[in-house]
């Protein structure tokens, strides 16, 4: 890995190498300055593997609301607007980090958690299983 | 919003409502128990809107490595294996939370940061702009 020279102005901590419990400032800094979120908002409908977004809410998690994609069909939409079952719609998934309140219901104590979310769908050529 | 009854066993904190600085345990709990990540690992190649994955590394961020998808073509792959420019490959983007070391180079002090990442690509019907 890359060794980072330690900043002498860091808060005190017992473990100087890789901390297990750290301080996190929840004032979110948003780096997404050059993007137009509206541009991608209709892809779910225009895609050949369209999807719907479902709201997943959990007050014990931060962020408490996550949107999950579910592919509408097993096949993909062809040029005529019909579902073509020679192709497969599949979810594109990503592991993301969230904060889980620990102990439960605590406002200022969390644990990092990895969850798998489905972000959208893509159309793929099926895997052909050859029977011997 | 949902009011959560406060757990009496919570660590002390000055702000009882919505903390700006919290304690986070970095021992990651992985909730992805029922998934097989290998199943989706070849979608980038089998998709009609294939993509390449680029490694984005930043030692001041946690996680330090994030993989970014970049669509291979402007169009989509048709049944003959050629690029069809009557359709568009577009990135599916998602806002994710990461931890940014703050002050810089500190091992135990972070700030939450939102970044936009491209997870994969999907094939969409183009928006047709009619000229008056």
């Amino acid at each position: 890995g890359i060794t980072i020279p330690r900043n002498p102005g860091c808060p005190n901590s017992e473990d100087k190498n890789f901390p297990r419990t750290v301080m996190v400032n929840l004032n979110i800094h948003n780096r997404n300055t050059n993007t137009n979120p509206k541009r991608s908002s209709d892809y779910y409908n225009r895609s050949t593997s369209p999807w719907n977004l479902h709201r997943n809410e959990d007050p014990e998690r931060y962020p408490s609301v996550i949107w999950e994609a579910k592919c509408r069909h097993l096949g993909c939409i062809n040029a005529d607007g019909n579902v073509d079952y020679h192709m497969n719609s599949v979810p594109i998934q990503q592991e993301i980090l969230v904060l889980r309140r620990e102990p439960p219901h605590c406002p200022n104590s969390f644990r990092l958690e990895k969850i798998l979310v489905s972000v959208g769908c893509t159309c793929v050529t099926p895997i052909v299983h050859h029977v011997a | 919003g949902i009011t959560i009854p406060r757990n009496p066993g919570c660590p002390n904190s000055e702000d009882k409502n919505f903390p700006r600085t919290v304690m986070v345990n970095l021992n990651i709990h992985n909730r992805n128990t029922n998934t097989n990540p290998k199943r989706s690992s070849d979608y980038y190649n089998r998709s009609t809107s294939p993509w390449n994955l680029h490694r984005n590394e930043d030692p001041e961020r946690y996680p330090s490595v994030i993989w970014e998808a970049k669509c291979r073509h402007l169009g989509c792959i048709n049944a003959d294996g050629n690029v069809d420019y009557h359709m568009n490959s577009v990135p599916i983007q998602q806002e994710i939370l990461v931890l940014r070391r703050e002050p810089p180079h500190c091992p135990n002090s972070f700030r939450l940061e939102k970044i936009l990442v491209s997870v994969g690509c999907t094939c969409v019907t183009p928006i047709v702009h009619h000229v008056a």
């Epitope: 409908n45 719907n52 977004l53 479902h54 709201r55 997943n56 999950e68 994609a69 579910k70 592919c71 509408r72 069909h73 097993l74 096949g75 579902v83 079952y85 497969n88 719609s89 599949v90 979810p91 998934q93 489905s118 769908c121 793929v124 099926p126 895997i127 052909v128 299983h129 | 029922n34 998934t35 199943r39």
Partner: antibody
Framework: QVQLQESGPGLVKPSETLSLTCTVS????????VSWIRQPPGKGLEWIGI???????DYNSAFKSRVTISVDTSKNQFSLKLSSVTAADTAVYYC??????????????????WGQGTLVTVSS | DIVMTQSPLSLPVTPGEPASISCKSS????????????LAWYLQKPGQSPQLLIY???TRQSGVPDRFSGSGSGTDFTLKISRVEAEDVGVYYC?????????FGQGTKVEIK
């Protein structure tokens, strides 16, 4: 508990539009999709169409040109409209909830809760 | 449209005895990406609306007794009742949810001998 209740006129004249309402309770509309199914007297079940949680629809192509499914979230109501009806549209019409499975990344077309059904007769 | 063919169309049964219903699809219901078969079974009791018994070929819906079991893959599927009870009478339907429109079998009427 989960409940779905169909309502509407029991008699419709040929060439007119059949209009039915499905009032639901006991589940979250933003999570679940709802389908309409019909059953002609003494016959089997026929899927008419679905309205997804976001208001999008998908119809059986046999009905496509004359069916409309919509939702009024504020009233917890779904509606079915079938235009230009004939005697062949006489049936018991059901609304049913599409199953929602967490950690499953496709819309689900299994129907895990049904209304009691309403008989619509097309006759002059 | 996918044709779902059930047999038999009528099944007289004796309480306590096993029963079996077959359902054949005109196309495979096995999705290669997740190896799931998109087939469900419903029971419509006399004067009632249908109720979901089994989905994905063999997963029992919550509250369904374990005497009901489903099996099969591809185009051939079976619903078995290990020991028929009087309350099991009605019409059983299979349904495919792979291809739109989502179609049902013509139904199998189970009645007590």
């Amino acid at each position: 508990q989960v409940q779905l209740q169909e309502s509407g006129p029991g008699l419709v004249k040929p060439s007119e539009t059949l209009s039915l309402t499905c009032t639901v309770s006991g589940f979250s509309l933003p999570s679940h999709s709802v389908s309409w199914i019909r059953q002609p007297p003494g016959k089997g079940l026929e899927w008419i169409g679905i309205i997804w949680n976001n208001g999008g629809t998908d119809y059986n192509s046999a009905f496509k040109s004359r069916v409309t499914i919509s939702v009024d979230t504020s009233k917890n109501q779904f509606s079915l409209k079938l235009s230009s009806v004939t005697a062949a549209d006489t049936a018991v019409y059901y609304c049913a909830r599409n199953m929602y499975i967490t950690d499953y990344y496709y819309e689900n077309y299994f129907l895990d809760a049904w209304g009691q059904g309403t008989l619509v007769t097309v006759s002059s | 449209d996918i044709v779902m063919t059930q047999s038999p169309l009528s099944l007289p049964v004796t309480p306590g005895e096993p029963a079996s219903i077959s359902c054949k699809s005109s196309q495979s219901l096995l999705f290669s990406e997740n190896q799931k078969n998109y087939l469900a079974w419903y029971l419509q009791k006399p004067g009632q609306s249908p109720q979901l018994l089994i989905y994905w070929t063999s997963t029992r819906q919550s509250g369904v007794p374990d005497r009901f079991s489903g099996s099969g893959s591809g185009t051939d599927f079976t619903l078995k009742i290990s020991r028929v009870e009087a309350e099991d009478v009605g019409v059983y339907y299979c349904q495919q949810s792979y291809y739109t429109p989502y179609t049902f079998g013509q139904g199998t009427k189970v009645e007590i001998k």
